[in-house]
């Protein structure tokens, strides 16, 4: 999947656009807002009715290295009692990000976009079936 | 930056951490194309803690629509489908990566850009803080 | 397209036992979770027992708690139902089911009646 180039007519070409070969794009990769920080309300995955658990993926070829996933704890959610209720479920929301995948061809090195699916956290739904066989 | 392992055989000059500019092929590496959370699940609405999708759309930024969620309520769904106020629902954040056109208009340079999202809600035991 | 087939059903008396078995034909469990869940005429469904493929997380109704006890075989692509202490409220017709994601539960069986007399 192709990045878009601008498309729209109101946008020119500014002459101060750095010459790029073909095929490929120059890219950055100091972080703009780099000290944002998450400010979520506190545990909220322990104090969630689909409460989830948190793994870090390290990859030193990716950037970058560190990513978390998330991995809901239950198949059901908990009830008021602080038990599990398999009349609903938990389950993940996800989002995509972008990292930059570095890859080794014998001794010269290529960089590469890579869309990464992360699961944020967990949410309780009521279920469905699709199917009654 | 980040420490890459070398091929041994490989000249030492090349440097161990990710350089600050790269440049990188055009075609973006995955299968997960499906960018709109709408059209690929419907959580947001069977959740006891749903939400609406809001489109954030910017043509300098890739991708440049990003659909940010809202909590419909401030408590939860119960089991008769009303709002139960003794529980909350809140918004799950997250930091993710996308790309700014840097100098600005330019169809070939970018900067990756941390944004932060709200991606869905959960409901949550509220924290009750006693005042003495 | 999977389908699954249940067997075991029967009438018991009440305090006795049955194992419920659902085999996926034509296919194997290649589902994110696998459960039974039961109807009783004039009765809501209810989910009594699910199994999460990917790290065997179990999990029971309230109802059938310390009763039942779900289980598979890999070897045999088969899921079990283990119930004891079976009540007269255990009578119903029981399905087993699979979600192929989270919260969607895709392919029902047929259903095996189980009739517990007292």
């Known amino acids: 999947r192709k990045i878009p180039k601008v498309g729209h007519t109101f946008f020119q070409k500014p002459e101060s656009c750095p010459p790029v070969p073909g095929g490929s794009m120059k890219l950055d990769i100091g972080i703009i807002n780099e000290n944002q920080r998450v400010s979520m309300s506190r545990n909220i995955e322990s104090r969630s009715t689909s409460p989830w658990n948190y793994t870090v993926t390290w990859d030193p070829n990716r950037y970058p290295s560190e990513v978390v996933q998330a991995q809901c704890r239950n198949l059901g959610c908990i009830n008021a009692q602080g038990k599990e209720d398999i009349s609903m479920n938990s389950v993940p929301i996800q989002q995509e990000t972008l990292v930059v995948r570095r890859k080794h061809q014998g001794c010269s090195v290529s960089f590469q976009l890579e869309k990464v699916l992360v699961t944020v956290g967990c949410t309780c739904v009521t279920p469905v079936i699709h199917h009654v066989q | 930056g980040i420490t890459i392992p070398r091929n041994p055989g490989c000249p030492n000059s090349e440097d161990k951490n990710f350089p600050r500019t790269v440049m990188v092929n055009l075609n973006i590496h995955n299968r997960n194309t499906n960018t709109n959370p709408k059209r690929s699940s419907d959580y947001y609405n069977r959740s006891t803690s749903p939400w609406n999708l809001h489109r954030n759309e910017d043509p300098e930024r890739y991708p440049s629509v990003i659909w940010e969620a809202k909590c419909r309520h401030l408590g939860c769904i119960n089991a008769d489908g009303n709002v139960d106020y003794h529980m909350n629902s809140v918004p799950i954040q997250q930091e993710i990566l996308v790309l700014r056109r840097e100098p600005p208009h330019c169809p070939n340079s970018f900067r990756l850009e941390k944004i932060l999202v709200s991606v869905g809600c959960t409901c949550v035991t509220p924290i009750v803080h006693h005042v003495a | 397209e999977v389908q699954l087939v249940e067997s075991g059903g029967g009438l018991v008396q009440a305090g006795g036992s049955l194992r419920l078995s659902c085999g996926a034909a034509?296919?194997?469990?290649?589902?994110?979770?696998t459960g039974w869940f039961r109807q009783a005429p004039g009765k809501e469904r209810e989910f009594v027992a699910v199994f999460r493929w990917s790290d065997s997380h179990t999990a029971y109704a309230d109802s059938v708690k310390g009763r039942f006890t779900i289980s598979r075989d890999g070897a045999k692509n088969t899921l079990y139902l283990q119930m004891s202490s079976l009540k007269p409220e255990d009578t119903a017709i029981y399905y087993c089911?699979?979600?192929?994601?989270?919260?969607?539960?895709?392919?029902w069986g047929q259903g095996t009646q189980v009739t517990v007399s007292s």
């Open positions: 089911t699979t979600a192929t994601r989270p919260g969607e539960w895709d392919y």
């Open positions: 034509g296919g194997t469990f290649s589902s994110y979770a």
